[in-house]
């Protein structure tokens, strides 16, 4: 119960995840004028990563495309990969997912593969959500450089004989929802990780031994819990059913080669 | 055709209450911000506030905190400014305008403050 | 508060003639987000509101005249009409849409010989 409920958990968190990155990704606000010097601004920029928007004292919103590609700079084109990257390992990985997630049955498909499966998303995952929070972290260190660069030529330029202020940006939400989205997604990736280890079965054959009180010759059986284990050569990598009221996660699972990843 | 329609004259007396309305039409009320202006006779324009009537989000001139109150009807896409403890200086002509760049302004309404 | 300062108050012109007014800024109405300058020109007739001419201190309102011109970057801003016609005898306003509060010259008053 407890791996299918890993496994479950792991893959809503991780949906949810994905969902914020491409929220953000797609967000216009991932920086925001500063108010700081201007609280009182009737016109308001922010800026995404795939346009730029003005909003005006009468209430509407202009936003303008950037239409160039090689005129971006480079970090934000960098960030940009970085969010696709993270976007497409992430439904790459939910389709993976879903296959894999105990609850579904597809056809005879053994534990082994959907033990690898779970891992594999897992790992996409965990990229995934790493590549969001790198894309996020670079455009924040970007827009701190950027902050700071700005007030030191607004008290050095000029000589103080005209007032104009220049517009500086800091954080916008979509740089929030990013950082949260992308631990979402690394957090529901670890958890596809540690749901692999309780999926896959013991593929090791136990010998049994019978220990006699002294005086009494030893007899070694080799496979002799065959039957009541159900890891026999006969049975591996099968399930067994004993007719009882148990789930499938209650049966035991043993380490496995999964177990150190 | 965008339209302003704002409501007629009003005589009153010091220290009486006024609400005028600002009925739009020919576009969606909620998509701008609603404007109010003052313009004294003979004077120059002087802006008092405006709503948002998506939200009902104000921002006023602090020149004109406490005596204007700007309230929306989306309904009935219509705009109300009051303006309270009135005296002779608030006699002058309130204009509601809206769009973009501002482009639209209200027919105007004529407040005259007497004894 | 941005200070709009019009100069002169008014003006005494006959027709065909070639009128310029102008806008001071106390602080400048640039915005570098879309490279616009936040200046707005109104004209004033008699027992009217006022109508919108020029956005951005240089773009025209359809259906304005192209011998109204806006021009000016920053601070100082400039409404000229190439060749004034009767009808443009009118209180020509600029106004800061830049900076709340949003805040409006005195006028230039446009007036015949």
């Known amino acids: 119960m407890a791996v299918t409920a890993c496994q479950g958990l792991g893959f809503v968190v991780s949906l949810i995840g994905i969902a914020g990155i491409i929220a953000a990704t797609c967000m216009d606000q991932w920086s925001t004028q500063d108010l700081y010097n201007n609280p009182v601004t009737a016109v308001f920029n922010y800026q995404g990563l795939w346009r730029s928007c003005v909003r005006e004292s009468s209430g509407f919103t202009e936003c303008r495309g950037y239409f160039t590609l090689l005129g971006l700079p480079a970090m934000l084109q960098a960030v940009r990969a970085l969010m696709i990257v993270g976007i497409v390992l992430g439904a790459i990985g939910l389709l993976v997912s879903i296959f894999a997630l105990k609850c579904i049955r597809i056809g005879s498909m053994e534990d082994s593969a959907k033990a690898n499966m779970t891992l594999t998303s897992g790992i996409m995952f965990i990229v995934s959500g790493l590549c969001a929070i790198a894309g996020v972290s670079v455009f924040a260190n970007m827009l701190v450089t950027n902050f700071w660069m700005s007030t030191a030529n607004m008290y050095t330029g000029m000589g103080g004989m005209v007032q104009t202020v220049q517009t500086r940006y800091t954080f916008g939400a979509a740089l929030f929802v990013g950082w949260v989205a992308g631990g979402l997604t690394l957090i529901g990736g670890v958890m596809m990780c540690i749901a692999c280890r309780g999926l896959a079965p013991e593929e090791t054959n136990y010998k049994a031994v019978s220990y006699h009180a002294s005086g009494h010759s030893v007899a070694y059986k080799p496979g002799g819990f065959k039957a009541s284990t159900g890891f026999g050569s006969n049975t591996k990598n099968k399930k067994i059913y004993d007719g009882g009221a148990r789930t499938e996660d209650e049966v035991q699972s043993y380490p496995s080669k999964h177990d150190y990843v | 055709e965008v339209q302003l329609q704002q409501s007629g004259p009003e005589l009153v007396r010091p220290g009486a209450s006024v609400k005028m309305s600002c009925k739009a039409s020919?576009?969606?009320?909620?998509?701008?911000?609603m404007h109010w202006v003052k313009q004294s006779h003979g004077k120059s324009l002087e802006w008092i506030g405006y709503?948002?009537?998506?939200?009902?989000?104000?921002s006023y001139n602090q020149k004109f905190k406490g005596k204007a109150t700007l309230t929306v009807n989306k309904s009935s896409s219509t705009a109300y400014m009051e303006l309270r403890s009135l005296t002779s200086e608030d006699s002058a002509v309130y204009y509601c305008?809206?769009?973009?760049?501002?482009?639209?302004w209200g027919t105007g309404t004529t407040v005259t403050v007497s004894s | 508060d941005i200070v709009m300062t019009q100069s002169p108050s008014s003006l005494t012109v006959t027709a065909g003639e070639k009128v310029t007014m102008s806008c001071k800024s106390s602080?400048?109405?640039?915005?570098?987000?879309?490279?616009?300058?936040?200046l707005t020109w109104y004209q004033q007739k008699p027992g009217q509101p006022p109508k919108l001419l020029i956005y951005?201190?240089?773009t025209r309102e359809s259906g304005v005249p192209d011998r109204f011109t806006g021009s000016g970057s920053g601070t100082d801003f400039t409404l000229t009409i190439s060749s004034v016609q009767a009808e443009d005898l009118a209180v020509y306003f600029c106004?800061?849409?830049?900076?709340?509060?949003?805040?409006f010259g005195a006028g230039t008053k446009l007036e015949l010989k």
């Open positions: 709503i948002n009537p998506n939200n009902g989000g104000t």
């Open positions: 602080q400048s109405l640039f915005n570098s987000g879309n490279q616009k300058n936040y």
């Open positions: 020919g576009y969606t009320f909620t998509d701008y911000n």
């Open positions: 305008v809206t769009t973009r760049y501002l482009a639209v």
């Open positions: 951005w201190a240089s």
């Open positions: 106004q800061n849409d830049y900076s709340y509060p949003l805040t």
